[in-house]
Interface confidence: low
């Protein structure tokens, strides 16, 4: 999905009002310095691409993020403020339902959510437009 045409300010507002708090809740009890940020992004469409990948694509050691509160709110924000996003996610959602796993917070998941926090913060920086 190409995130270029999303309403970035509305997504930013959704992040600031709720998603950020849900990410903090998920990370509660973890020191902010515990994980190094290794995933990066440089503009808003790129940041959303990385955020979507880390939030919804199962990875080795962390398969359960998509059912977390912050993930559901992220999905809702993208569906509302990114034209055509919902349609691209139908097949992915159906595939995900077939292999639902037991919800467990692993250290790998905590590390992944720490990366997400960094990506979201980068998303919120003032955007430089191509001139």
């Amino acid at each position: 999905y190409d995130f270029t045409n999303c309403d970035f300010e509305k997504i930013k507002a959704a992040y600031l009002s709720t998603i950020s708090k849900d990410l903090i809740t998920y990370m509660s009890g973890t020191k902010s310095t515990e994980f190094n940020n290794t995933v990066s992004c440089s503009n808003r469409p790129h940041c959303l691409t990385e955020i979507q990948s880390l939030t919804f694509n199962p990875t080795a050691g962390c398969a359960s993020l998509a059912k977390e509160m912050f993930a559901m709110k992220t999905k809702a924000a993208l569906a509302i403020w990114c034209p055509g996003y919902s349609e691209t996610q139908i097949n992915a959602t159906q595939a995900m339902k077939k292999r639902r796993k037991r919800k467990v917070t692993t250290n790998k998941c905590l590390e992944q959510v720490s990366q997400l926090q960094g990506l979201w913060r980068r998303f919120n920086r003032p955007l430089l437009k191509q001139q």
Epitope: S40, S42, H46, G118, R122, P126, L128, Q130
Partner: antibody, heavy 121, light 105 residues
């Protein structure tokens, strides 16, 4: 180790242009913004502009708009600042400075050594 | 454009004294960064995002403030602290204050 190495000193005549380079190493060049800041002798720091090496997006200080052009060569991990229609008051040290995310703010955490540009007839 | 005004322009103090540097913004900003510069050198990041000391900065330095008013404080001046300090914001276009020179009295 992050390093920003700038090109050498330049002496230019009024009306000419100057192009200063800033070679980055020790990090992924496209991950962070690059600022350009200048400082005339005995004067304050003056922000000129910023570029995203990822997409070439730029933002300029209105004072320099139309005279300054920021570009990057991603393959060479190098940022460039070109200033045209030089005048004597452009005599200054020109710095490139990486801007990274840290502590909930975007700060200029690594600076080049500076390039002295002298404009004189 | 947000204008940053630093005061005083020059602060003449003796080693061991307390230094208070002020930076005022023409409109509210989220946070303020501070840089130290010594003659012939590039600026060095000193305090990130209002109150976080950069790597290697001694604990005698502290930063505080919010909105339009920010402060850098040096609890007890050491000889190596005498330098020029600049505040900087990055809320919209980036911008620096005019600097405060901390000199030996």
């Amino acid at each position: 180790e992050v390093q920003l190495v700038q090109s050498g000193a330049e002496v230019k005549k009024p009306g000419a242009s100057v192009k200063v380079s800033c070679k980055a190493s020790g990090y992924t060049f496209t991950d962070d913004y690059m600022n350009w800041v200048r400082q005339a002798p005995g004067q304050r720091l003056e922000w000129m502009g910023i570029i995203s090496p990822y997409n070439g997006g730029t933002s300029y200080n209105q004072k320099f708009k139309g005279r300054v052009t920021l570009t990057v060569d991603k393959s060479a991990s190098t940022a460039y600042m070109e200033l045209s229609s030089l005048r004597s008051e452009d005599t200054a040290v020109y710095y490139c400075a990486r801007e990274d995310y840290d502590y909930d703010g975007y700060a200029m955490d690594y600076w080049g050594q500076g390039t002295t540009v002298t404009v004189s007839s | 454009e947000i204008v940053l005004t630093q005061s005083p322009a020059t602060l003449s103090l003796s080693p061991g004294e307390r230094a208070t540097l002020s930076c005022r913004a023409s409109s509210s900003v989220s946070y303020m960064h501070w840089y130290q510069q010594k003659p012939g050198q590039a600026p060095r990041p000193w305090i990130y995002a209002t109150s976080n000391l950069a790597s290697g900065v001694p604990a005698r330095f502290s930063g505080s403030g919010s909105g339009t008013s920010y402060t850098l404080t040096i609890s007890r001046l050491e000889p190596e602290d005498f330098a020029v300090y600049y505040c900087q914001q990055s809320d919209n276009v980036r911008g620096f204050g005019g600097g405060t020179k901390v000199e030996i009295k």
